[in-house]
Interface confidence: low
């Protein structure tokens, strides 16, 4: 029921032991008594007792204090129970009766006779109050007090609104005096069913099953589930939604894998030489003479420049070298003769011209020749005049450079960027990396080239089924699906068969 | 309107097995808490089972726990109940209920129920 009408009779006096026909009983009145609750009535009619009717067991003879009781026969407050809103207004008869026969079972025995009745009608609110009053006549006077109280989950002024305490997966909360609910920390919603997941946790990226608690959805991080994800094997780049690489300031590539400025980072080139970035590995290095090597990092020998002139052979030494001149030239190159013209000193048709009043000579040799006595053989190669590995090529009296691709110049010290064409589309940046360009696409638009105008939002159609979530941009369809526990297909259309054991967890 | 209609129900022998399915029509199936209650003769309604709309979640009476298995199909707007090792107690008419969201799961917070299917259990 919704709550209880509670009488508590206090005290009966019947001094004289008479019934309320004039007799007396005989050896004295046995007084147990009958309640009757009902609608309220302003005359107070037979009839059914619509609110509910109890009796007592004999509670003493002629007059007698009532003791409360809370079990068993005889309990004092009498309970009226009703399974209703109460309505706020009552009638009420209470009568004494003498009985001959059964304590414990007076409405039972026959002989029974009434002593006194008293009727009370009027308006009643719930509440913990007790009303007292005391009822007179001729012979006998009543002392009594009653109340209404809601039942256990029942709250409001009529005892209408109905409410468990609980904390369950149903709902997790207390009853206000109300009968509205009041949550317990942690959990908030119309039935306290929703957790409050951890401060800060993000709204659309994270979730929760209990409360301070935040759980990711697919492609956040962090413990705010704040933090994207970049693509998997994104090296040097970030991402501002999930699965996105967008490099880092110097970074190329699908992976951000590809050093645009390895020179500056790196500083690959050794012993003054210049590095530029271009090349197969993303940087060359331009070696000072006297070095060699991918890196500049091999000194070559002393004698590599050929620093001996006129013939004379070289000898490395520990920081130096040595000339070995030949008969007729001295000096630390062997710069300095000797000879004379008349000495025939110039080879392979040179002309000899006198200089220092005869006393030393000068070659000028014909094409193709060189050196002091034009006893060289022009390799215009040897100087090695062709950068970014460039191949170098006698052609007569002159060289030239056939350069590697994406190469140009005389020396091939000029790099064709194949940005320079501006391949990229719609705005796009380009990149220059070994394999050719690689254009970084603004929002909108996709392809090697930017090419592609992204017309619609895949996802927008809401192609994936049974509460997957859509992304777009990671597959040629240009969606994927990904499905919830329970659920697979490119679409999470086929549901997986369901493992006996339960609850799951969210 | 949502329409439920249960099927699956029969006479088992104690120790079997029977499937139980509700398919509901109308408005989007996928939003809405699915449960299955029970009512044997002369007794009240009681709760068997509840899942949540992403199927993520499901709940069981003690009485019921670890026999019985609540799941759900959103592309078939099927709810179901697996019932194991069925006991004579299990006898009753099983009802299919579901409910709005943000509602607790609860018999009467559900928003519709269906007619019912007979199980019963003999020894």
């Known amino acids: 029921g919704s709550g209880i009408f509670q009488l508590r009779l206090q005290e009966f006096v019947n001094q004289r032991g008479m019934l309320a026909n004039g007799q007396s009983c005989e050896p004295g009145c046995r007084t147990f008594f009958r309640i009757c609750l009902k609608h309220f009535q302003a005359t107070f009619s037979e009839g059914p007792c619509t609110f509910g009717n109890v009796s007592t067991p004999v509670l003493g003879t002629n007059s007698f204090v009532v003791r409360d009781k809370n079990s068993g026969s005889g309990r004092n407050p009498l309970q009226l129970p009703f399974n209703f809103t109460w309505p706020g207004t009552f009638s009420l008869n209470i009568q004494a009766w003498h009985t001959p026969g059964d304590d414990l079972r007076p409405e039972t025995s026959p002989g029974n006779s009434l002593i006194s009745q008293i009727i009370i009608q009027g308006s009643l609110a719930v509440g913990k109050i007790w009303r007292t009053d005391e009822q007179n006549d001729t012979l006998t006077r009543l002392s009594y007090s009653y109340r209404v109280i809601c039942s256990d989950n029942y709250y409001g002024e009529s005892c209408s609104r109905l409410c468990k305490k609980r904390d369950d997966h149903f709902g997790h909360y207390e009853c206000q005096p109300d009968g509205s609910l009041s949550c317990l920390p942690g959990w908030t919603g119309k039935y306290c069913d929703q957790p409050i997941c951890l401060s800060g946790c993000h709204e659309q990226n994270g979730y929760c099953s209990k409360p301070d608690e935040c759980i990711c959805r697919p492609g956040w991080q962090g413990r705010l589930c704040n933090e994207c994800i970049p693509h998997n094997g994104c090296r040097h780049g970030t991402c501002s939604i999930p699965w996105q690489c967008a490099c880092d300031e110097g970074w190329g590539g699908l992976f951000c894998d590809q050093d645009l400025n390895y020179c500056t980072h790196h500083s690959p080139c050794k012993n003054g030489s210049t590095c530029s970035n271009s090349g197969p590995k993303g940087y060359t290095c331009t070696c000072l003479p006297g070095y060699t090597g991918e890196h500049c990092e091999l000194g070559l020998s002393k004698c590599a420049s050929n620093p001996c002139r006129n013939g004379g052979s070289c000898k490395d030494q520990e920081n130096s070298y040595h000339c070995l001149c030949p008969p007729g030239y001295y000096g630390q190159h062997c710069e300095h003769s000797t000879l004379t013209c008349a000495d025939s000193p110039c080879f392979n048709g040179g002309s000899c011209r006198e200089r220092n009043q005869g006393s030393s000579y000068a070659c000028e040799c014909p094409p193709n020749f060189t050196g002091s006595n034009c006893e060289k053989k022009v390799d215009r190669c040897t100087s090695n005049p062709c950068a970014n590995g460039g191949q170098c090529q006698n052609r007569g009296p002159s060289r030239t450079c056939r350069c590697r691709p994406g190469f140009t110049g005389t020396h091939c010290e000029l790099h064709i960027s194949d940005c320079a064409r501006s391949p990229c589309a719609h705005g796009g940046t380009c990149h220059d990396l070994e394999n050719g360009p690689v254009c970084t696409c603004p929002a909108g638009f996709s392809g090697r080239r930017c090419e592609v105008r992204i017309t619609h939002d895949a996802c927008a159609s809401g192609p994936c089924f049974n509460g997957a979530t859509c992304y777009t941009g990671l597959s040629p369809n240009n969606f994927v699906c990904n499905c919830p526990y329970g659920f697979v297909g490119s679409r999470c259309e086929f549901p997986v068969g369901l493992p006996p054991s339960f609850p799951w967890v969210a | 309107e949502v329409q439920l209609v249960e099927s699956g129900g029969g006479l088992v022998q104690a120790g079997g097995s029977l499937r139980l399915s509700c398919a509901a029509s109308g408005r989007t199936f996928s939003s809405y808490a699915m449960a299955w209650y029970r009512q044997a003769p002369g007794k009240e309604r009681e709760y068997v089972a509840a899942?949540?709309?992403?199927?993520?979640?499901?709940y069981y009476a003690d009485s019921v726990q670890s026999r019985f298995t609540i799941s759900r199909d959103n592309a078939k707007n099927t709810v179901y109940l697996q019932m194991n090792s069925l006991k004579p107690e299990d006898t009753a008419v099983y009802y299919c209920?579901?409910?709005?969201?943000?509602?607790?799961?609860?018999?009467?917070?559900?928003?519709?129920w269906g007619q019912g299917t007979q199980v019963t259990v003999s020894s």
């Open positions: 899942i949540r709309w992403s199927g993520g979640t499901a």
């Open positions: 209920a579901n409910r709005a969201p943000d509602t607790r799961l609860e018999p009467y917070e559900y928003d519709h």
